[in-house]
Interface confidence: medium
C-alpha cells in the first residue's frame, strides 16, 4: 500500500558539517532507492525551531532528492525532539500538504543527541516511528534508552544505534526490510 514517510533530521550544533552532510546523503539515498514505489517523502530539520525542508506535495511535484534538499541550511542550535515530533504529526501529515489519507504514516528520526526539551508525543500515536541515534552521545545504555520514548514498540525493532555517521550508508537495506 501507500506509505507517507517523513525524515525528521537533527540540525543541532553538536553535529559537525560533514556529519550533517552524511544525514542529507542518507535521506537522498533512501529516496532514490524508493523513487518508483508507492512512497511519498517529506523532510523536516529540527533544532531549537523546526523547518519543513520539503513537504509531500513538493515531493510529488519534483521527485529529485538533490534539488529538494539543495537549500538546507544547518540550524546549529538545540535538540527539541518532543516539539519536532509533535510538529510533524500535526503540521506535516496534512492532506492539504499532500499527505494521503489511506497511506501508512512513517517517521524516521535521525539524531545525534538527547532531547533538550520535554513533553509527550501523544499526537504521533498513529505514526510508525523509527529513531536512529548516531555517534558518541549514545555510547551508554542509559543514553540509548532516552530514545525509546520517541520510537514505536518494540525498541529492538524501531530504535537503531550507530557508532558513526559512516554506518548510515549500510542502514538502508536493514530499514527496507522493516518498512
Amino acid at each position: 500500500g501507500n506509505v507517507d514517510l517523513v525524515f525528521l533530521f537533527d540540525g543541532s550544533m553538536s553535529l559537525q558539517p560533514d556529519e550533517f552532510q552524511k544525514i542529507l546523503d542518507f535521506m537522498k539515498d533512501v529516496m532514490k532507492k524508493l523513487s518508483n514505489t508507492s512512497y511519498q517523502f517529506a523532510a523536516v530539520q529540527f533544532s531549537t525551531s523546526y523547518k519543513t525542508e520539503f513537504d509531500f506535495s513538493d515531493y510529488v511535484k519534483r521527485k529529485d532528492p538533490d534539488a529538494l534538499l539543495k537549500h538546507v541550511k544547518h540550524m546549529l542550535l538545540l535538540t527539541n525532539t518532543f516539539g519536532a515530533i509533535n510538529y510533524v504529526a500535526t503540521e506535516v501529515f496534512r492532506e492539504e500538504l499532500g499527505a494521503r489519507p489511506d497511506a501508512t504514516k512513517v517517521l524516521i528520526i535521525i539524531t545525534d543527541g538527547e532531547a533538550t526539551d520535554s513533553g509527550n508525543i501523544d499526537a504521533a500515536k498513529d505514526i510508525i516511528r523509527y529513531i536512529i541515534g548516531i555517534g558518541k552521545h549514545f555510547q551508554t545504555k542509559e543514553s540509548q534508552e532516552t530514545l525509546h520514548k520517541f520510537a514505536s514498540k518494540p525498541a529492538s525493532e524501531f530504535v537503531c544505534i550507530l557508532d558513526t555517521f559512516e554506518c548510515l550508508k549500510d542502514l538502508f537495506t536493514e530499514l527496507q526490510k522493516k518498512i
Epitope: S49, N86, Y87, T90, E91, L97
Partner: antibody
Framework: EVQLLESGGGLVQPGGSLRLSCAAS???????VMWWVRQAPGKGLEWVS?????????YYADSVKGRFTISRDNSKNTLYLQMNSLRAEDTAVYYC?????????????WGQGTMVTVSS | DIQMTQSPSSLSASVGDRVTITCRAS??????LNWYQQKTGKAPKALIY???SLQSGVPSRFSGSGSGTDFTLTISSLQLEDFATYYC????????FGQGTKVEIK
Amino acid sequence: EVQLLESGGGLVQPGGSLRLSCAASGFTFSRYVMWWVRQAPGKGLEWVSYIWPSGGNTYYADSVKGRFTISRDNSKNTLYLQMNSLRAEDTAVYYCANSYDFRSNAFAVWGQGTMVTVSS
Amino acid sequence: DIQMTQSPSSLSASVGDRVTITCRASQSIGSYLNWYQQKTGKAPKALIYAASSLQSGVPSRFSGSGSGTDFTLTISSLQLEDFATYYCQQSYSTPSFGQGTKVEIK
C-alpha cells in the same frame, strides 16, 4: 505580493471585547505560523500570541493569557484574535505577522496594523 | 526571559554617513537575531534575519553581523528614506525586542 490586512480595531470600554481579523494573500497561508504583535503608543514591540499552521497549538504572552484567544480559518486565509476583559494597558496598534519558517519566531511580513483603544 | 538592549537609543546623522547600531542579548542566542525598520505611523519591516541574512528587496547598504550576545546593524551610506526607528529581536526563544534606536536627521 504577500499581504496581511488587519481589521476590527476600535474604541472599547475596560472589560469589553473586540475581535480582530487578519486577511492574508499572496502566500500559502495554511503552511505558516501566524502571530499577533502589538505596540502601545510611543512604546516598543511586544508579541501577543501565535498559532501553528493547522491551528492545533496556540501560545500566549503572560500579559494576555486567559483573556485573548487566537484562531485561524485556513479555508478563508484569515487569522483572528478574540480579545475579552480588555484593560487600559491593552491599548496599542495590533499587527499580524508571519514567520520565516516554523517556530523561527522571526517576523517576515507584517500587516499595516489596527488600533485598539481601551478607555472609558 | 531574554532581555535585548540596544544602543544608542537615538542618534543624529547626515545623508551619506555610515551608521552603526548595536544590540546585546542577556544570554547567548547563536545567530537568532533579526532587525526591523519602522517609520512613523507605519508597520515594522523586516531588514535582516539570522543575524546577517538580508531580507529580499532590502538594499545592500544594510548589513548585519555578530553572534552569541553581541550584534551590529550597519547602514553603509545613510539615505533619506533610512531615517526611522530600528529594532532588534531575538528569536532563540519566546521573542523579545530591543527598545529601539531612532535615527534622526542631523
